[in-house]
């Protein structure tokens, strides 16, 4: 047993054009009240079919009189929750209808008049004991915002309100085989009431009304020992085998229900309980329409006016999935070029570009050399978002403005002396060395360790290498 609770947050004009006229006027003040109808499962029954899970009516809201010329605002609401008590287990999946009624308070003969302003319906999956679920539903130009939850009434606990809890009899622990009732640790699970007639020796249950058998026992009440002898012996055709039980594959093995449907065994086949938006033997057919509001995160729903046609959600930037339910990590696609840093701001994507690059995706390579002159005959070289000057001989520095000392780096090897020259530098080599940088030793026999000389040159001619 438990209670379904509905909290109406607002009822007023929906977004978009065509705001509805206020339901009340100075001449006809009125007040609102709400009705909720609940049905188990995901049935799309007519609004008139019985509210098998229960129904509730809210109190009347405050009297409202329209201000002339003002657009219809959110209308004043009744106080408190709508509560629908349920006596049996909470089914987990349910259909709801919420109706907004107007009570006119003018000078009607015979008392107030009632008229239906809006009706919204939907199918949802909900575990008892969970947090409040928020929802927005539209009916014509009206929008209803509400929250709902299902909670168990003590001593029932669990997602279906089927486990029972009792205050502890002993202060320290629960009875044999009984667990503490989280989150009420000071209470204990009560023994379950199994199916009537379930064998106390050979049967047990995990849900009320169930009868599960210990190994070696079978039958609906666990009173039949599992026979090792055969109940199918070779004999003539058309043999009746009443009472013969054989093991076999479970009807729901491998879960034949698609799209998250839950499977239950039936004598000849199986039955799928389909999640919101699906129907068919195996929940393989999508029955959601735009009226069900299937698009999340501000997605725009197109199509799906009749139950057999599909709908398409056009997702806003930053969301994807058939129902716009997944947030896109847009930076994972590395949209920023040239090493730019990606920032997903939710409503937009930003690229923070490295120096030398610009554009929404850092795709433009700025002309690094634009307006950058290299002095003294140097040439500008672009690259990596920064400019560089390739300086003429005798000059250096970022812009080739510094006169270079070619001898500063001590380019002459083996003690050779360096002289700056208008064309660069000249090395005067120490005895026994030769070459442009005095890098080659001269051997005593007159040969040198020079590389093979080009044709027409003598290996020992140092002047030609200066």
């Amino acid at each position: 047993a438990g209670v379904f609770e509905l909290q109406i947050h607002s009822f007023g004009p929906g977004p978009g054009p065509g705001a509805p006229r206020s339901p009340c006027s100075a001449r006809l003040p009125c007040r609102l009240f709400f009705r909720v109808c609940l049905k188990p499962g995901l049935s799309e029954e007519a609004a008139e079919s019985p509210c098998a899970l229960g129904a509730a009516l809210s109190a009347r809201g405050p009297v409202y009189t329209e201000q002339p010329g003002a657009p219809a605002p959110d209308l004043p609401l009744p106080d408190g929750l709508l509560q629908v008590p349920f006596r049996d287990a909470w089914p987990g999946t349910f259909s709801f209808i919420i109706e907004t009624w107007r009570e006119e308070l003018g000078d009607q003969i015979g008392g107030p008049a009632w008229s239906l302003l809006a009706r919204v319906a939907g199918r949802r999956r909900l575990a008892a004991g969970g947090p409040w679920a928020r929802d927005i539903q539209r009916a014509g130009a009206w929008e209803l915002r509400f929250s709902y939850r299902a909670r168990c009434e003590p001593p029932a606990v669990g997602t279906a309100c089927t486990r029972l809890c009792r205050p502890r009899s002993a202060p320290s622990r629960c009875g044999p085989g009984l667990r503490p009732c989280a989150p009420l640790e000071d209470e204990c699970e009560a023994p379950l009431v199994c199916r009537a007639g379930c064998s106390p020796e050979h049967g047990f249950c995990e849900q009320p009304g169930e009868c599960r058998c210990l190994e070696g026992w079978t039958g609906p009440l666990c009173t039949v020992p599992v026979s090792t002898s055969s109940c199918l012996s070779p004999r003539g055709p058309s043999s009746a085998t009443t009472g013969c039980l054989v093991p076999g594959p479970g009807p729901c093995d491998g879960n034949p229900c698609a799209n998250g449907g839950s499977c239950s065994e039936t004598p000849r086949s199986f039955e799928c309980t389909c999640p919101r938006g699906f129907y068919g033997l195996r929940c393989e057919v999508s029955g959601v329409t735009c009226a069900d509001g299937p698009c999340f995160n501000g997605g725009l729903c197109v199509g799906g006016a009749d139950p057999d046609s599909a709908y398409i959600c056009h997702c806003p930037p930053g969301f994807q999935g058939s129902n716009c339910e997944k947030r896109v990590d847009r930076c994972s696609l590395q949209p920023c070029r040239n090493g730019g840093l990606c920032l997903d701001l939710g409503h937009a994507l930003r690229c923070r570009c490295r120096a030398g690059f610009a554009g929404p995706r850092c795709e433009h390579d700025l002309d690094d050399c634009a307006g950058r002159a290299c002095a003294n005959g140097g040439t500008c070289v672009e690259g990596g978002g920064a400019h560089r000057c390739s300086c003429a001989l005798g000059f250096g520095g970022r812009d080739c403005r510094e006169r270079a000392d070619p001898c500063a780096a001590r380019p002459c090897a083996h003690g050779g002396r360096c002289y700056a020259h208008f064309s660069g530098l000249v090395c005067a080599c120490a005895p026994g060395y030769m070459g442009a940088r005095c890098e080659f030793p001269v051997h005593p026999d007159g040969a040198s360790a020079l590389p093979a000389a080009p044709p027409g040159l003598r290996p020992g001619d140092p002047q030609r290498y200066l």
Partner: nanobody, 126 residues
């Protein structure tokens, strides 16, 4: 009068194939659940395959999954069991039976059989 008559059994080498037939009379198989039950020497019965022709529902025991295929021709009121890649452990008497799911207990699902045929022997041996 309800009758189920199996045929198609015989001796086959490992890796071979057989097709068993189950001709039903006295009821319409389209609206019933038909199963093939086997009894191997020294073992209990096991429902190896099951079909409900109304919705095309089929189920197989793990031991035969991927090798056996159950089917039904409602115009002939006949069910079939196509057995491929046969193994020595498939040797058994195979019965065709009208079956209904009964319950789950002791880690097994159980089926109640109300009518069955006389059985056909399948021997897999080299």
């Amino acid at each position: 009068e309800v009758q189920l008559v199996e045929s198609g059994g015989g001796l086959v080498q490992p890796g071979g194939s057989l097709r068993l037939s189950c001709a039903a009379s006295g009821f319409n198989i389209e609206y019933e659940s038909i199963g093939w039950v086997r009894r191997a020497p020294g073992k209990g019965e096991e429902l190896v395959a099951r079909i409900y022709p109304t919705n095309g529902y089929t189920r197989y025991a793990d031991s035969v999954k991927g090798r056996f295929t159950i089917s039904a021709d409602t115009s002939k009121n006949t069910a079939y069991l196509q057995m491929n890649s046969l193994r020595a452990e498939d040797t058994a008497v195979y019965y065709c039976a009208r079956s209904e799911y009964s319950h789950y207990s002791g880690s097994h699902h159980y089926y109640a059989l109300d009518y069955s045929g006389q059985g056909t022997l399948v021997t897999v041996s080299s």
